[in-house]
């Protein structure tokens, strides 16, 4: 059969199975006169064999872990011995079989972990090889854990990253783990090759021990300090140890005061700076935060309270400079005549803040001293031994002294012996009518003007008037605001009237004095008067249940999944219409009936979250009056953007020749959200023949170094494919390219001769 | 891969005598015309003598009488016995298989004739 397994010498690939006794010849090579013989050179480790005639062939069977590519040449030759054709090359592929099993590095390995490290976060690796070919699932490996001991409520510590070996904890191992419990774990692995998936795959197993380490990267307990310290600042007051030694310690105040008293130094010891003040701030809450050499955090911050103690550093005040109170000539003795409250900023509840009242003075002592008392706790001033007569003695001058357990200070009062209270007030007229307002009608609105009067001492609390509304307005829709000249009272509307649930409202005003009536006389009709508020109906809009709505899903929800409702309604009680308004980018829909929200496609948190929209609510019928809410979607990251390259890295270059091994770093980022930590990107090349020029190390969470392995490159540009896995779940891989141009220099520079090529790299290193 | 060593290259006086062998590795040895080249300092490469796989030989002009090549097709060598050597001999000489224009070549052996 001309052209498959016979023909002229020329360049050819032949694949060939390993493991396999040969069962036929490889090719004839046809020779040309004067060609007589064929020669065979090369790898041919006395397996292959060429006739003279030029039948090529193997003798027996190959081994890929041996050789996995024969480089063979042919060469025809004359009579003489002379090559007349070739030497051609002729390659033989071995392709693999699975005819070795895996095998673990290390029989046991050890490894340790410390307590709530992160989730996913490699301790340890396990590592196993296979002579065959790994890009065949003959030597593709798969790890696994076959047991873990102990296992605690059948729940996993511990992962095992199936392709890389890589051992992390599990989202509970992380939580639970805790070295006081249990303070070691065995873990059986496996590891399979076949990529786990055949039933005829090889397998080996290895054992893991463990440990469990403390994390004392732990919150310490609240402190507490005493306010106005004159110890010398500043002042150790606790402590804070990330885990292993060379982190960088700050403080980060959340709150944004204008003065942090706080600071912390490099042994992670924190002090408070200055004298603190309780009456300023009684607490403070800030987080300590712990960092690499690169300024990235190691974990999440620590929570930091300190509670400020209070000491007795403030005197009692008075309410005012002088409290005025009035009593009537005739009253009894015990009554009430007012309480005198004073104030003190430090603690209360506490010995520092409690107050005891005494009065220290009586000015006139007529008819004697001793007319008042006042009650030692509560200030509550009483008459003491008699009535009072205006005509003897209309005004008393009381000193009190107001003492907490330190300090003193003197407070003032001002008692008025005023006429008896036994005129009550009369309206002057009993029913002001009928009022008709529209439903819309402003609040502060003034509707009604009333009035009564009162015959006793003028401008005494015997004579004012106050004006309640005692029937007819439950939902304190109205308020009267009195005139203390004139005793007039102004009927307004403090909230919106509603044709809808009163549009008749029967209302009864009720005139009484702030002073008590004398003994034996009462409030009558006189004192009460009646109108009748009579409210029209406006044709209103609807009204939503919320000015704003808020829900939150997963950014990777299913297209037409439910995400949030609106709920509104008509004052008149028409049906409703909803639609939506500025969905900017077309991802949701409403239900014109019941209000519910859904998404039409798919969200990307990374597009911006919350997602703002508004709803509007409108009467179907009337007058098609409609209302505006807001809805907010707050969207939660899920892990769908793969890292890339932080900026542009066109116009990197080396001076060539390289007089040694040169690096250069570059940061990778992604758009998904991470919080205090920020990323954990691990870096790779991007294919295994760039690993004989390339090496790539990662530096932290979003930095690596990419380094050249010799210094023998040509004067051109490489590019490097890198590989940068964010570690998220799933996780996610960019393939990001870092052109690397290799150049002659001129004073550090890429030399280009004139008219050569544009885009000259700029960046040396 | 095929392999052609040279040695026995050397400093001799005028009128002495050399022998330059070739071991050759990764080829059936016997199937080969097997020859010696020389080149000397700015000048070509010239063929000095060289013997087919039957044992025929052939000899350069300048070389004949003087020069003799043989081969032992047993130890894979070939040899180049220069007897009353000139200044003008002075050359690297090569190994060759298969003839010039397509065979194999060694890396050369230096000779120097001078007093």
């Known amino acids: 059969q001309e052209g498959k397994f016979s023909g002229p010498l020329k360049p050819m690939t032949f694949s060939i199975y390993e493991g396999q006794e040969p069962s036929q010849i490889i090719f004839q090579f046809k020779a040309n006169p004067p060609a007589v013989t064929f020669e065979l050179t090369g790898e041919t480790d006395n397996i292959f064999v060429i006739e003279r005639e030029g039948l090529l062939y193997y003798n027996r069977a190959l081994d890929r872990e041996t050789r996995s590519t024969h480089n063979l040449q042919v060469a025809a030759l004359d009579a003489n011995g002379i090559i007349v054709e070739g030497p051609v090359p002729i390659t033989i592929k071995v392709k693999d079989i699975n005819d070795n099993r895996p095998t673990f590095l290390q029989s046991k390995y050890e490894g340790s972990v410390r307590q709530n490290s992160r989730p996913g976060k490699p301790f340890l690796y396990v590592n196993a090889t296979d002579l065959d070919d790994p890009a065949t699932p003959n030597g593709q490996l798969y790890y696994q854990i076959v047991i873990q001991l102990p296992m605690i409520n059948n729940v996993m510590y511990f992962q095992i990253n199936n392709k890389t070996g890589a051992i992390s904890l599990t989202r509970e191992g992380s939580q639970e783990l805790n070295p006081a419990k249990n303070p070691s774990y065995n873990l059986v692995i496996s590891v399979k090759d076949m990529g786990g998936q055949s039933e005829n795959s090889f397998s080996d197993t290895t054992s893991v021990d463990i440990i469990v380490t403390e994390n004392i990267w732990k919150a310490p307990k609240p402190v507490e300090m005493v306010e106005n310290s004159t110890d010398p600042h500043p002042i150790k007051i606790t402590q804070v140890r990330w885990n292993d030694p060379g982190a960088q310690y700050s403080l980060v105040d959340k709150e944004k005061l204008p003065r942090f008293p706080f600071s912390i130094d490099q042994e992670g010891d924190i002090y408070v700076t200055q004298p603190l003040d309780r009456e300023e701030k009684d607490a403070y809450v800030f987080y300590a935060v712990a960092k690499d050499e690169y300024g990235k955090p190691l974990s999440y911050p620590l929570e930091i309270h300190v509670k400020v103690k209070d000491i007795n550093d403030n005197p009692p005040t008075c309410p005012s400079p002088v409290t005025v109170f009035e009593v009537q000539e005739n009253e009894r003795l015990g009554n009430s005549i007012g309480t005198l409250t004073a104030h003190d900023r430090d603690e209360e509840n506490t010995a520092n803040s409690f107050l005891n009242y005494r009065i220290v003075e009586q000015t006139p002592k007529l008819p004697m001293d001793g007319l008042f008392l006042i009650q030692t706790y509560a200030g509550m001033l009483q008459l003491a031994k008699q009535s009072l007569k205006k005509q003897d003695t209309p005004q008393y001058n009381l000193t009190i002294e107001v003492s907490d357990k330190d300090f003193k200070t003197l407070c003032f009062v001002q008692i008025n012996v005023i006429d008896i209270n036994d005129q009550i007030p009369i309206f002057e007229k009993s029913d002001y009518g009928n009022l008709t307002l529209a439903e819309d009608t402003n609040i502060g609105s003034t509707i009604l003007t009333i009035q009564a009067t009162d015959a006793d001492e003028p401008f005494t609390g015997s004579s004012k008037i106050l004006y309640h509304i005692i029937k007819g307005d439950s939902e304190g829709r109205l308020g009267v605001d009195t005139d203390p000249h004139t005793n007039t009272g102004y009927v307004i509307i403090k909230k919106p009237l509603d044709f809808e649930t009163a549009a008749v409202s029967n209302i009864v005003f009720k005139a009484e004095n702030p002073e008590p009536l004398v003994f034996g006389v009462k409030y009558n009709a006189s004192s009460f008067a009646k109108f009748t508020l009579i409210v029209t109906d406006v044709n209103e809009a609807p009204q939503f249940s919320q000015h704003v709505f808020q829900a939150k899903v997963s950014e990777d929800v299913a297209i037409g999944t439910k995400v949030g409702n609106v709920t509104a309604k008509d004052p008149e009680g028409l049906d409703i219409s909803y639609s939506l308004r500025g969905d900017t980018r077309g991802w949701l829909k409403i239900d014109h009936v019941t209000g519910e929200i859904f998404s039409v496609a798919p969200l990307d948190r990374e597009a911006g979250s919350p997602y703002r929209v508004q709803v509007v609510a409108t009467e179907v019928g009337g007058s098609s009056l409609s209302s505006v809410s807001e809805f907010h979607l707050i969207l939660m990251d899920v892990n769908d953007n793969p890292p890339r390259l932080a900026k542009d890295y066109t116009g990197l270059f080396f001076c060539h020749p390289l007089s040694a091994p040169g690096s250069l770093i570059f940061e990778a980022t992604d758009d998904d959200q991470h919080l205090f930590r920020g990323p954990h990107f691990t870096f790779s090349l991007g294919s295994g023949s760039l690993q004989n020029d390339w090496e790539v190390s990662k530096i932290n969470g979003t930095h690596a170094r990419l380094s050249t392995r010799h210094t023998e490159f040509e004067e051109r540009e490489y590019v490097v494919l890198i590989r940068i896995n964010d570690g998220g779940r799933p996780p996610l891989e960019g393939i990001v390219s870092l052109p690397v141009t290799f150049c002659s220099c001129v004073e550090g520079s890429c030399f280009r001769p004139a008219g050569h090529q544009t885009g000259i790299p700029t960046v040396g290193m | 891969e095929v392999q052609l060593v040279e040695s026995g290259g050397g400093l001799v006086q005028p009128g002495g005598s050399l022998r330059l062998s070739c071991a050759a590795s990764?080829?059936?040895?016997?199937?080969?015309?097997m020859g010696w080249y020389r080149q000397a300092p700015g000048k070509q490469r010239e063929l000095v003598a060289n013997?087919?796989?039957?044992?025929?030989?052939n000899y350069a002009d300048s070389v004949k009488g003087r020069f003799t090549i043989s081969r032992d097709n047993a130890k894979n060598t070939l040899y180049l016995q220069m007897n009353s050597l000139r200044p003008e001999d002075t050359a690297v000489y090569y190994c060759?298989?298969?003839?010039?224009?397509?065979?194999?070549w060694g890396q050369g052996t230096q000779v120097t004739v001078s007093s």
């Open positions: 990764g080829m059936r040895f016997s199937q080969y015309a």
């Open positions: 060759n298989a298969g003839g010039a224009a397509l065979g194999y």
């Open positions: 013997i087919f796989k039957d044992g025929t030989t």
